[in-house]
Interface confidence: medium
């Protein structure tokens, strides 16, 4: 999906008002310095591409993020403010339904959510030069 036509300001507002708090709740008890940020993004559409990938694509050691509150709200924000996004998800959803995973918070998931926090922070500061 091409995130170029999203309403970035509305997505930013949703992040600041609620998604950020859910990410903090998920990471509670973890030191902010515990994980290094290894995933980066260069502009807002790129950030949303990376955020979608890390939030919804199962990875080795962390298959359960899609069930989390921050993930549901991320999906809602993309559906509401990115035209045509919902349609790209219909087939993917039907495949996902066949492989439900148990909800387990692993160290790998915490690391992944730490990366998400970094991507979201970058999304909110699009004019900063890439490090």
């Amino acid at each position: 999906y091409d995130f170029t036509n999203c309403d970035f300001e509305k997505i930013k507002a949703a992040y600041l008002s609620t998604i950020s708090k859910d990410l903090i709740t998920y990471m509670s008890g973890t030191k902010s310095t515990e994980f290094n940020n290894t995933v980066s993004c260069s502009n807002r559409p790129h950030c949303l591409t990376e955020i979608q990938s890390l939030t919804f694509n199962p990875t080795a050691g962390c298959a359960s993020l899609a069930k989390e509150m921050f993930a549901m709200k991320t999906k809602a924000a993309l559906a509401i403010w990115c035209p045509g996004y919902s349609e790209t998800q219909i087939n993917a959803t039907q495949a996902m339904k066949k492989r439900r995973k148990r909800k387990v918070t692993t160290n790998k998931c915490l690391e992944q959510v730490s990366q998400l926090q970094g991507l979201w922070r970058r999304f909110n500061r699009p004019l900063l030069k890439q490090q």
Partner: antibody, heavy 124, light 107 residues
Framework: QVQLVQSGAEVKKPGSSVKVSCKAS????????ISWVRQAPGQGLEWMGN????????NYAQKFQGRVTITADESTSTAYMELSSLRSEDTAVYYC?????????????????WGQGTLVTVSS | DIQMTQSPSSLSASVGDRVTITCRAS??????LTWYQQKPGKAPKLLIY???SLQSGVPSRFSGSGSGTDFTLTISSLQPEDFATYYC?????????FGQGTKVEIK
Amino acid sequence: QVQLVQSGAEVKKPGSSVKVSCKASGGTFSSYAISWVRQAPGQGLEWMGNIYPIFGYANYAQKFQGRVTITADESTSTAYMELSSLRSEDTAVYYCARYGQYGQHFSHGGMDVWGQGTLVTVSS
Amino acid sequence: DIQMTQSPSSLSASVGDRVTITCRASQDISISLTWYQQKPGKAPKLLIYGAFSLQSGVPSRFSGSGSGTDFTLTISSLQPEDFATYYCQQFYFHSPTFGQGTKVEIK
């Protein structure tokens, strides 16, 4: 199974306001949006606006901008549609509908569950 | 706002007929299209979402096709309970607009 139950019929004077409620049961209220759609006698369907309780965000059809306010009370799983400065052309059946689901498994933009409709008559 | 134009506005058909209703969007909406059936005095019923996905519980004689600007709802073999008004609706940017409706009447 989600159900939407709307408030009863209303008769209003021109220039006044009406507030119609839509109570949801049987699902997670914040995991979907609520749309409001109206239908004047013998006419087609007209979308008025959506509310997304998950963010407390509402968007409206241009035609109704400034005259309609859609709100949601998550504690009672109820959505409200208030239309002000009523005129005779606002006489219609007003429907609420579940619009899209944003749960773990993504749904779609269809309005798949509808309230029974509320007839609002505007007459002097 | 995106305009949706349905054709025909009404049609007469017999039980067993194949019926086709078309819907045209004023701009590209990908597959962000739904079809509804409405009977007099009742709320609309969702038939098709995402242009071609059949809503759960809807008979397989209903099908949808198209993408971009041109869409079609087909009833392969019209049944007595299918006489109703049909509406298309786009939701490309979550500001949905409906077509004006197609009334399917008994010939």
